[in-house]
Interface confidence: medium
């Protein structure tokens, strides 16, 4: 029986040119996480495999950074990044858990808002 629950950042907003963290957390289960997939609609953004580590899809590698934790950082946001994002936890023996985040990217009102940052 699948007893786990996924907590996510829910509905979030950010401004064009800025950066954002997508974050999920799986709780209430003793299942072992074997892999986490991050997807945007039907596109694969990144994979974090328990044994192999992170893989960022080549088409996103300039704008996507792994972490913090099992989360994903999106940079240089555009209005086209608006939409649904999914964290898909592959676990054993439970199976698959999916969390949903809706991101709205807003037109920037102040140019300096497009601040960049780094994940150490």
């Amino acid at each position: 029986m699948m007893t786990g629950t996924i907590e996510t950042t829910g509905n979030i907003s950010a401004e064009k040119g800025g950066s954002i963290i997508l974050q999920c957390h799986l709780s209430s289960t003793t299942a072992q996480v074997t892999q986490v997939n991050w997807e945007q609609q039907d596109q694969l953004l990144a994979i974090c495999n328990a044994d192999l580590g992170w893989h960022i899809s080549p088409s996103f590698k300039d704008r996507v950074a792994p972490g913090p934790g099992l989360g994903l950082t999106l940079q240089s946001l555009t209005v086209n990044d608006t939409g649904e994002y999914f964290c898909i936890y592959h676990t054993y023996p439970d199976g698959t858990y999916t969390g949903r985040i809706f991101l709205e990217v807003l037109e920037s009102s102040v140019a300096e808002h497009g601040a960049r940052f780094q994940i150490p």
Epitope: T8, T9, G18, A115
Partner: nanobody
């Protein structure tokens, strides 16, 4: 528009402690995510810690075991308890709410020096 007001910074000796607060107000989604970043002179802004509304926390390796992040979502406020401070923790500290890092607040300056 979202407004973020950080407070609690100051001058502290190495090994000392500070507690930073961040109050968020205005029109924002209530996703329940809050985070702290910092920017040292001449360096890029870097992530320090994050908390989800359920109490789940993440920390940069450089602060793990010394800093504790928490949030009171009913008050739209985040906190960063900083213990065993080091000179390399000197920076302007910023908070952010709901995963979106814009707009930034003014930040609060933490100086660790003897």
């Amino acid at each position: 528009e979202v407004q973020l007001v950080e407070s609690g910074g100051g001058l502290v000796q190495p090994g000392g402690s500070l507690r930073l607060s961040c109050a968020a107000s205005g029109n924002t989604f209530s996703g329940g995510f809050m985070g702290w970043f910092r920017q040292a002179p001449g360096k890029e802004r870097e992530w320090v810690a994050s908390v989800l509304r359920g109490g789940y926390t993440w920390y940069a390796d450089s602060v793990k075991g010394r800093f504790t992040i928490s949030a009171d979502n009913s008050k739209n406020t985040a906190y960063l308890q900083m213990n065993s401070l080091k000179p390399e923790d000197t920076a302007v500290y910023y908070c952010t709410r709901d995963g979106g890092f814009d707009p930034w607040g003014q930040g609060t300056l933490v100086t660790v020096s003897s």
